[in-house]
Structure formats: C-alpha cells, structure tokens
C-alpha cells in the first residue's frame, strides 16, 4: 500500500567509520521526499532529516549516545510538498534498515603515524589517537578511550634498503622497537579489533620513513 507515485526506499546501508555514521539508500527521489526515523534506547522512533531530497542522513548524533546499543532506522517516503500525506493504510511507505551496532560494526579509519623518535638503537613510534564524536562527560572520546585494550595496532617496519619486513603489536598507541644503528627504517600501522569477526582491520596508514619530517633523532 502507499500513496500514488511514491516509491519505497531500498538498499538501506549503514556507512560508518570511527563512529561517524550515515544511513544511505536508493532511489534518487522523483516527486517525493524522505524522512528518516531511528529507534532510540527506549524503542521510540526519533525523526531525522525530515522532508529531505537527499538519499543519505547523518545519524552520528544519535548512535554516539550508546555505541553498544543495536539501532534500527527506517526511511519514510512522502509525496513532494506533502510530508503529512500517508498511504491507504494510514501510514507512509517505509523501509527498515538492517540493525546496526556501532561498537561492533563501525569501520576503523585509516590510522596515522603521529611521530617517531630514535634514541640510539631504539625507535618509539606513536600512532595518533583519533578523536571520535562519542562523548562522555561533555568530552569527546578518542578511539582508544572507546575500545580500550580491544584495539590493537600492528606495526610493519623495514629497512629502507631492504624488502624484508618485521612486525610488532601494541594495545596502547606506542611501539618501542629495536633498530640497527645507522639504518633508516620505514613504518606503517594498521588498527585491529581482535574481538570482532567482521570489519576487524583498518587499511594501512600512509608509510612514514626515517629521514623525513615526522621523525626525530637523538644519540
């Protein structure tokens, strides 16, 4: 059932990275508009992106309230210029999204190597602790704040002069590795959530090499 010339949304997809979360759908609207509803923790439906002609809606503000909650959204279709109009059954056409649990499903963004510092034959490599839009006590939490020890960084490193790689891991944001004196090394990191079965790993960070800006050398 539904209003004449109004089509239901389809292909509802959550796109989420480091908790920045957007619901996307199809089709591009023709003579219709969309409104999104998302279920809160009380199972009430909250209206978002009312009367939009976009095919996406940023739901970050809602999902960061509790990243462990399992959310459901739906996209309502209305004739253009009449957001109150309903279908023959007294309701607008709508389509439900898949369920979405931010903690388990948000993609890990590409990490960044913040700095590296060499002291003798040791190098300290620091990964930037990216800020998320998740809040606690009016403060934005970092990725490490949210995931704690459930976030591991894997470091790949190799001599600039050779192809043989080594790896190390940390459940903090710092690595302390042994290097050969007088050799330049390159570094790349990857984030991993060990407890997950999908969306476990980020893409690799950009490669950073010693002898470039980010590093510091001390005897």
């Amino acid at each position: 059932s539904g209003t004449t010339n109004t089509v239901a949304a389809y292909n509802l997809t959550w796109k989420s990275t480091n908790f920045k979360t957007i619901l996307e759908w199809e089709p591009k609207p023709v003579n219709q508009v969309y409104t999104v509803q998302i279920s809160d923790r009380s199972r009430n439906w909250k209206y978002k992106c009312t009367g939009t002609t976009d095919t996406e809606c940023d739901l970050t503000d809602e999902i960061v309230k509790d990243v462990n909650w399992t959310y459901e959204a739906r996209v309502l279709s209305y004739p253009a210029g009449n957001v109150e109009s309903t279908g023959s059954a007294g309701e607008p056409l709508y389509e439900n999204s898949p369920e979405f649990t931010p903690y388990l499903e948000t993609n890990l963004g590409q990490p960044t190597i913040q700095s590296f510092e060499q002291v003798g034959t040791k190098v300290n490599v620091t990964v930037e602790d990216e800020r998320t839009l998740v809040r606690r006590n009016n403060t934005f939490l970092s990725l490490r704040d949210v995931f704690g020890k459930d976030l591991i960084y894997t470091l790949y490193y190799w001599k600039s002069s050779s192809s043989g790689k080594k790896t190390a891991k940390t459940n903090t944001n710092e690595f302390l590795i042994d290097v050969d004196k007088g050799e330049n090394y390159c570094f790349s990191v990857q984030a991993v959530i060990p407890s997950r079965t999908v969306n476990r790993k980020s893409t690799d960070s950009p490669v950073e090499c010693m002898g470039q800006e980010k590093g510091e050398f001390r005897e």
Epitope: I152, T154, Y156, K165, K166, T167, A168, K169, T170, I177, Q190, V192, P194, S195, T197, V198, R200, K201, T203, D204
Partner: antibody, heavy 117, light 107 residues
Framework: QVQLVESGGGVVQPGRSLRLSCKAS????????MHWVRQAPGKGLEWIGL????????IYDPKFQGRFTISADNSKNTLFLQMDSLRPEDTAVYYC??????????WGQGTPVTVSS | DIQMTQSPSSLSASVGDRVTITCKAS??????LNWYQQKPGKAPKLLIY???SLADGVPSRFSGSGSGTDYTFTISSLQPEDIATYYC?????????FGQGTKLEIT
Amino acid sequence: QVQLVESGGGVVQPGRSLRLSCKASGFNIKDYYMHWVRQAPGKGLEWIGLIDPENGNTIYDPKFQGRFTISADNSKNTLFLQMDSLRPEDTAVYYCARDNSYYFDYWGQGTPVTVSS
Amino acid sequence: DIQMTQSPSSLSASVGDRVTITCKASQDIRKYLNWYQQKPGKAPKLLIYYATSLADGVPSRFSGSGSGTDYTFTISSLQPEDIATYYCLQHGESPYTFGQGTKLEIT
C-alpha cells in the same frame, strides 16, 4: 563453523619445491592474519611467517626468508606456502593457523612433508 | 630477535599435584604471551592468552601469570587428561618464537 584444512604435503627430493595449501571455511581469511607453523618429528613448534591476505603484507622468520613464500587467494579463501630448495631438515608437519591478534585461535590438522632422496 | 627459554623440558607429577612451567623472554614482551597444549598427532590448543587470560572452554585449573620477561603457567590440580606437551609463544614482535616445550608425564 571455522575450519582450516591443509593439503599438498608428501615426499619430495632434496632441492625440489613443494606448495602447501590451507583452505579456510567459516570465515574470510582477509579479515585475519594467517600464519604457517611447522613441527619436525619429535621436536618443538617453529614459526615460519604470516600474511595479511587483505593487503599481501608478509613477515617471515629470517631463517625462511627467500626460500619460503607465503601467499593467499582471497577469492578461494586459501592460504599457500611455497617451499623451494627443500632440505632434509625441512621434514616436518606444517600447520596453518588463524590469528585474532591476541592469539592463534584456530589451527589446521597439519600436513606432513618428508624431504628425502 | 626474542628468545624464549622454557623450563623444565620435561616433568613428572601425580594426579592432583600442582604443576608449574616457566617461560623467560630475552626482552620485555609486554604480556603478548600464549600457552598451548599439544597432544601427540594433534594441533596445538590454546589455553592462556595475553599471559593471564583463560581461553574459552578451558578448565579453571589452568592459569597464567607474569609480565615483562617472566611468565608462569600453572595447573592447580593435575588431571590424567592433562598429559601433553605445553608450549609458550611470544607474539609481541616478529619473528614470533615458541618455547622449547615441556613434556608432562604422570608418575
């Protein structure tokens, strides 16, 4: 359920090559790091190396670098170990294992390789 | 490279005994240490991860402790089914290294 099944082992002459396979089911290998470990008869476990199948990054114990090559075919959900210039001391049971980053949580049953003339 | 020294290489104990195995790393491995049990002809089985955490489905008589370079694996009350070889594994940095193994027998 998660399963790893190795194959390709057997008897091979010194100096020859052998390619072992590890077929995964119940998960996508590209979501994990994957390892090869071996065990010579009556001896302990020995780590060979790992691959991140998603980006092809490989890490080896230096003693195997250059002679052994780990690769993966994500479309077939299969891990490989190419072993070249085999020696009698490479005689062992070869295991593949899945790594969740805190531990190796699943292992194959192992495939035996005998290097002998 | 990090060396793992596991001791003893073998030990004999009675049912009900408390059994302890140690692994010493040549440098700080920051608790990235696992303990595995292996029975003849079988693949290793995870018992303890991150030095102290008990793997799912593993009886509570198994435990792990330690940090830095020194780690201990304990069976609080040895059972007949615990007859196996036990290995530690450090995976904090490559090359990953196993201890030499401890073969446990019942007297």
